[in-house]
């Protein structure tokens, strides 16, 4: 009989090589039985994982598994780093392995972010 615990299927030591400027979806595969758990993404900063509050996320449901997706529209150079998803289930916090994004910046360092980037990430203006 399969366990009815929530399970987060991010591979240990997984990595993604992506290009700045491209859209990218980072998936957290989630297995659950009855009620879908509350899932969040965070980005590792040293030993702490900083919750990503104001980022676009969505769910994709498939037959045997669901995916909690963190959207990068577009990918920015400072999206480089390690991410983890976490699920709250029956007062327990379940954490995934971390997954690392390696962002290649295809633009020259002197070029400013585009209007589209500013529109999709307005908080860039206030950093």
């Amino acid at each position: 009989k399969e366990s009815c615990d929530v399970q987060l299927y991010i591979k240990r030591q997984s990595e993604h090589s992506i290009l700045a400027g491209d859209p990218f979806e980072l998936e957290c595969p989630v297995k659950y039985c009855a009620n879908r758990p509350h899932v969040t993404w965070c980005k590792l900063n040293g030993t702490t994982c900083v919750k990503l509050e104001d980022r676009q996320t969505s769910w994709k449901e498939e037959k045997n598994i669901s995916f909690f997706i963190l959207h990068f529209e577009p990918v920015l150079p400072n999206d480089n780093g390690s991410y983890r998803c976490s699920a709250n289930f029956q007062s327990n916090l379940i954490e995934s392995h971390s997954t690392t994004l390696y962002v290649t910046d295809v633009k020259s360092a002197s070029e400013r972010p585009s209007k589209d980037e500013m529109a999709s990430r307005p908080w860039l203006l206030y950093r």
């Epitope: 299927y9 991010i10 591979k11 240990r12 030591q13 997984s14 990595e15 993604h16 090589s17 392995h97």
Partner: antibody, heavy 119, light 112 residues
Framework: EVQLQQSGAELVRPGASVKLSCTVS????????VHWVKQRPEQGLEWIGR????????KYDPKLQGTATITADTSSNTAYLQLSSLTSEDTAVYYC????????????WGQGTTLTVSS | EVVMTQTPLTLSVTIGQSASISCKSS???????????LNWFLQRPGQSPKRLMH???KLDSGVPDRFTGSGSGTDFTLKISGVEAEDLGVYYC?????????FGGGTKLETK
Amino acid sequence: EVQLQQSGAELVRPGASVKLSCTVSGFNIKDTYVHWVKQRPEQGLEWIGRIDPANGHTKYDPKLQGTATITADTSSNTAYLQLSSLTSEDTAVYYCATDYYGSSLLDYWGQGTTLTVSS
Amino acid sequence: EVVMTQTPLTLSVTIGQSASISCKSSQSLLDSDGKTYLNWFLQRPGQSPKRLMHLVSKLDSGVPDRFTGSGSGTDFTLKISGVEAEDLGVYYCWQGTYFPYTFGGGTKLETK
């Protein structure tokens, strides 16, 4: 039942290239890493590298990077090891092994492929 | 890279006798997730390696409980209490904490 079926023995000339295959049955290779391990005659085991078939991302032992290339075809549930510029040092048995979600760590192994590099 | 050093190189035992193999790593194998990715494999003559133990001490399915794994940090031990004929072969430790992953040099278990 999980099985890893490797391609047959190869005899190749020095300087040539060869591509070995490892077909996985019993689960989707997207859910695993596939590793390749080398064993020279009467020697120990050497980790060559691994691939994440879900996105094609690879890791290699730096000593072997450049001569070994690992790829995967998720439609056929098969991983490949390509070895180029072969020398007698590449004469060995090559094993593939799986690693479910990166946590099971070489739990299933193929039967091995014997590669002989000789003129 | 992490160097895995196994001792002894060869271990000659009488069937029924106990055996112990040591594996030392050049740095701690404790990962940031709190787990230690240290496995033991047995390669019988003419066969593929078979995993016996993972995460230092977790016995794999179908492996007899005469095998026990112990250790932490950099020092690990595989013990066989009462060696049987099917246990003969070469034993390898392996670390999966750091890239590149590395095997120990192997310990050949043979009969006297």
